[in-house]
C-alpha cells in the first residue's frame, strides 16, 4: 500500500523555539516515522532537517538550527515505514516574520504602596530579536486580587513603578511584549501576584517640581513632617529601556544630599543635555520613608519652559492679561520655539476659591469679577506637545484691585 | 564564567594599613557594583561598603567611614580595599562581592584573612 | 542603620525536617531581602533575592516569602549538604545590613 504524505503542516516559532506540527494523514498505517528537509533561497539541493529525522510523533523541533531568520526558508515532509510516500512541500516563509515574541520574565517587588516591575525578554541573548533588544515595550494588565477589576498599561519599558496602591493588598499583573516596528505584540506571561507592605511610618515625598533660577536648577517638593533629611537621586531615562538589565546606578546630587529643607538648589551644569528621573527620600534619623514618585525631567525643555510674564489691565468686571516671553537673567526674552497653552489661576484676595482658564492666546480676558476688589493672578505655561509633556513652574502671583463700576468700555 | 580572585592572607601591625584587591573576570566590572564584607572569626558578616567602578562613587557603613576606602582600576577588572589604623578587632575575612542584578550580591571572592598582631 | 534579627540563632535538626528561620528588620524594607548560605571556611552563596525569588540553581526545597518587616526562609526537607550557617540581608537602604545568622547543626 503506497504511504500518503503528511498534511497541514504547522511552523510555529516563538522567539527562538521552532516547532513543527502535523497531521498524519493516514491513521491506521502503524509504526510511521517522518522525516523534514529544508531549502534556502537560492540553493538547489534539500538538506535534512537535524531534529527532525525519523520522528515517531507529529511534532518537532528544529531550534538547534542555525538559520538566518531574515532568509525565505521551504521545508518538505515526507512519511516513511517500508517504503516512502512523496514529499509534501510546505510554502516558503521567512523566520522572523512568522516568530511570535514569547512571554516575558516578570520579577516583582513591592513597597506599601507601590509596585516595581522589571521585565525581561523569555528568551535570554534571543537570536531572533538580537537586532530588537532595544525596541521592546511593554504592556501590562494589572487588578486588585479581590476585585479582578483591571487596568491597562501600555508602552511601558524594562522597568516600570506603579503608584498610589493600597497597603497589604494583593495585586496581580500579567505583561506582554511589543515590537512596534514589526507589528509584533507577543504573548502574555503567566500571572505574577505580590502583597504590598504595610503602610510606612513616613510617607515619600511628593509633587516634585524643576525650575529654572538663574544658572540653577531648583528643586522643590511636598512633605508631611517637620524636622527631616533629604536626598535626591538621578538616573539616566534611556536606563529603562536596558533589556536584561536590572541593576539601576541611581546617582546622588551633591547639593541635595541630607538637605534640611524640602528644596535643594544644583547648578545646571550638573546635568548635560539629556533626559533624566529624578526622585526624592525623607528621612528622620531612625526611619526612612520609601522613594518618592520618579519625575521625568528634561533638560531641553526645562532649561526654557520658564514661568511666564504677564501684564494685567484692570477693568471694573474683567482682567485683561497680556502674555510676555519669559526673561531670563540679564532679563533677554526666552525664545519659545514650541506651541504652549497657558494656564491662569484667579482668586479673590480675600478668598481661597481659585478659578482656572485654560487659552492659547496670549491675550486673555478674565471675566465676571468685582468692583473695586482685588484679585490675584498667577500663569503657567505646559507645552502642548503630547509627548514632551511639560509644565512650568507658577509665576509669582500678581494683585490687582479692580475698577469702580461703568469702566468696562 | 565570573570569578573574582582576592589576594592573599596579609599580618599587620597594629596601626599599620594594608591594600586589599580583588580581581572580576567573565564580566565588565563597570557594570556592576563591587562590595567588600567583612567577617571576623566566628562572628557574622558586616557590610564594608561598595563602588560603582563606572566613576569612582563610593557608599560606607558609617563604622567604616574614614578607615576604609575603596577603590577601582577598571583596565585591570581589580577593585581594592584599603584599611588604615589597623587594631585587633580588623582581623577577618575580607570577601568581595559583585553587586549585580536587583543590586544582589551575586559572586563572592573566595576571601582574603586579614590578621592584625604585634 | 535598619537592624534585622534572626530567629532562632542556633538549631539543631535532622535530616528530613522542615526549618523555618526567620528575619525582622526594624523598619520597613519592602521585598528588598536576600537569603545567604555559608559553610565553614567558604564564601557565602545567594539562595533567594528579593524576598521570594530562588536562585537559578538553588534546590527547589529552598523558599523565601515576607515583606515590609517580617521575612522567612523555609526548607522544606533538610538535607545533609543543607547543613550551614543562614544569614538574611537588606538592601533596601545603605548601608546594607545583616541579620546576625542562624546556624543549623546535626542533632
Known amino acids: 500500500k503506497n504511504l500518503k504524505s503528511p498534511q497541514k503542516v504547522e511552523v510555529d516559532i516563538i522567539d527562538d523555539n521552532f516547532i513543527l506540527r502535523w497531521n498524519r494523514s493516514d491513521e491506521s498505517v502503524g509504526n510511521v516515522t517522518f522525516s523534514f528537509d529544508y531549502q534556502k533561497t537560492g540553493m538547489d539541493n534539500w538538506i535534512k532537517l537535524s531534529g527532525c529525522q525519523n520522528i515517531t510523533s507529529t511534532k518537532c523541533n528544529f531550534s538547534s538550527l542555525k538559520l538566518n531568520v531574515y532568509e525565505e526558508i521551504k521545508l518538505r515532509i515526507r512519511a516513511e515505514k517500508e517504503n516512502t510516500s512523496s514529499w509534501y512541500e510546505v510554502d516558503s516563509f521567512t523566520p522572523f516574520r512568522k516568530a511570535q515574541i514569547g512571554p516575558p520574565e516578570v520579577h516583582l517587588e513591592a513597597e506599601d504602596k507601590a509596585i516595581v516591575i522589571h521585565i525581561s525578554p523569555g528568551t535570554k541573548d534571543s537570536v531572533m530579536w538580537a537586532l530588537d533588544g532595544l525596541s521592546f515595550t511593554y504592556s501590562l494588565v494589572i487588578w486588585k486580587n479581590s476585585s479582578g477589576v483591571e487596568e491597562r498599561i501600555e508602552n511601558i519599558y524594562s522597568r516600570h513603578k506603579i503608584y498610589k496602591l493600597s497597603p497589604e493588598t494583593t495585586y496581580c499583573l500579567k505583561v506582554k511584549a511589543a515590537l512596534l516596528t514589526s507589528w509584533k505584540i507577543g504573548v502574555y506571561s503567566p500571572v505574577h501576584c505580590i502583597k504590598t507592605t504595610v503602610e510606612n511610618e513616613l510617607p515619600p515625598p511628593e509633587n516634585i517640581e524643576v525650575s529654572v533660577q538663574n544658572q540653577n536648577y531648583v528643586l522643590k517638593w511636598d512633605y508631611t513632617y517637620a524636622n527631616m533629611t533629604f536626598q535626591v537621586q538621578w538616573l539616566h531615562a534611556f536606563l529603562k529601556r536596558n533589556p536584561g538589565n536590572h541593576l539601576y546606578k541611581w546617582k546622588q546630587i551633591p547639593d541635595c544630599e541630607n538637605v534640611k529643607t524640602t528644596q535643594c538648589v544644583f547648578p545646571q551644569n550638573v546635568f548635560q543635555k539629556g533626559i533624566y528621573l529624578l526622585r526624592v527620600q525623607a528621612s528622620d534619623g531612625n526611619n526612612t520613608s520609601f522613594w518618592s514618585e520618579e519625575i521625568k525631567f528634561d533638560t531641553e525643555i526645562q532649561a526654557f519652559l520658564l514661568p511666564p510674564v504677564f501684564n494685567i489691565r484692570s477693568l471694573s468686571d474683567s482682567f485683561h492679561i497680556y502674555i510676555g516671553a519669559p526673561k531670563q537673567s540679564g532679563n533677554t526674552p526666552v525664545i519659545q520655539d514650541y506651541p504652549l497653552i497657558y494656564e491662569i489661576i484667579f482668586w479673590e484676595n480675600t478668598s481661597n476659591a481659585e478659578r482656572k482658564i485654560i487659552e492659547k492666546k496670549t491675550d486673555v480676558t478674565v471675566p465676571n469679577l468685582k468692583p473695586l476688589t482685588v484679585y490675584c493672578v498667577k500663569a503657567r505655561a505646559h507645552t502642548m506637545d503630547e509627548k514632551l509633556n511639560k509644565s512650568s513652574v507658577f509665576s509669582d502671583a500678581v494683585c490687582e484691585k479692580t475698577k469702580p463700576g461703568n469702566t468696562s468700555k | 564564567q565570573v570569578q573574582l580572585v582576592q589576594s592573599g592572607a596579609e599580618v599587620v601591625k597594629p596601626g599599620a594599613s594594608v591594600k586589599l584587591s580583588c580581581k572580576g573576570s567573565?564580566?565588565?566590572?563597570?557594570?556592576?557594583?563591587m562590595h567588600w564584607v567583612k567577617q571576623a572569626p566566628g562572628q557574622g558578616l558586616e557590610w564594608i561598603g561598595r563602588i560603582d567602578p563606572e566613576d569612582a562613587e563610593t557608599k560606607y557603613a558609617p563604622k567604616f567611614q574614614g578607615r576604609a576606602t575603596i577603590t577601582a582600576d577598571t583596565s585591570t577588572s581589580t577593585a581594592y580595599l584599603e584599611l588604615s589604623s589597623l587594631r585587633s578587632e580588623d582581623t577577618a575575612v575580607y570577601y568581595c562581592?559583585?553587586?549585580?542584578?536587583?543590586?544582589?550580591?551575586?559572586?563572592w571572592g573566595q576571601g582574603t584573612l586579614v590578621t592584625v598582631s604585634s | 542603620d535598619i537592624q534585622l534579627t534572626q530567629s532562632p540563632s542556633f538549631l539543631s535538626t535532622s535530616v528530613g525536617d522542615r526549618v523555618t528561620i526567620t528575619c525582622k528588620a526594624s523598619q520597613n524594607v519592602g521585598t528588598n531581602v536576600v537569603w545567604y548560605q555559608q559553610k565553614p571556611g567558604k564564601s557565602p552563596k545567594v539562595l533567594i533575592y528579593?524576598?521570594?525569588y530562588r536562585v537559578s540553581g538553588v534546590p527547589s526545597r529552598f523558599s523565601g516569602s515576607g515583606s515590609g518587616t517580617e521575612f522567612t526562609l523555609i526548607i522544606s526537607s533538610l538535607q545533609p549538604e543543607d547543613f550551614a550557617t543562614y544569614y538574611c540581608q537588606q538592601k533596601n537602604n545603605y548601608p546594607y545590613t545583616f541579620g546576625q545568622g542562624t546556624k543549623l547543626e546535626i542533632k
Open positions: 562581592a559583585r553587586g549585580g542584578n536587583f543590586y544582589v550580591m551575586d559572586y
Open positions: 528579593s524576598a521570594s
Open positions: 567573565g564580566f565588565n566590572i563597570k557594570d556592576y557594583y
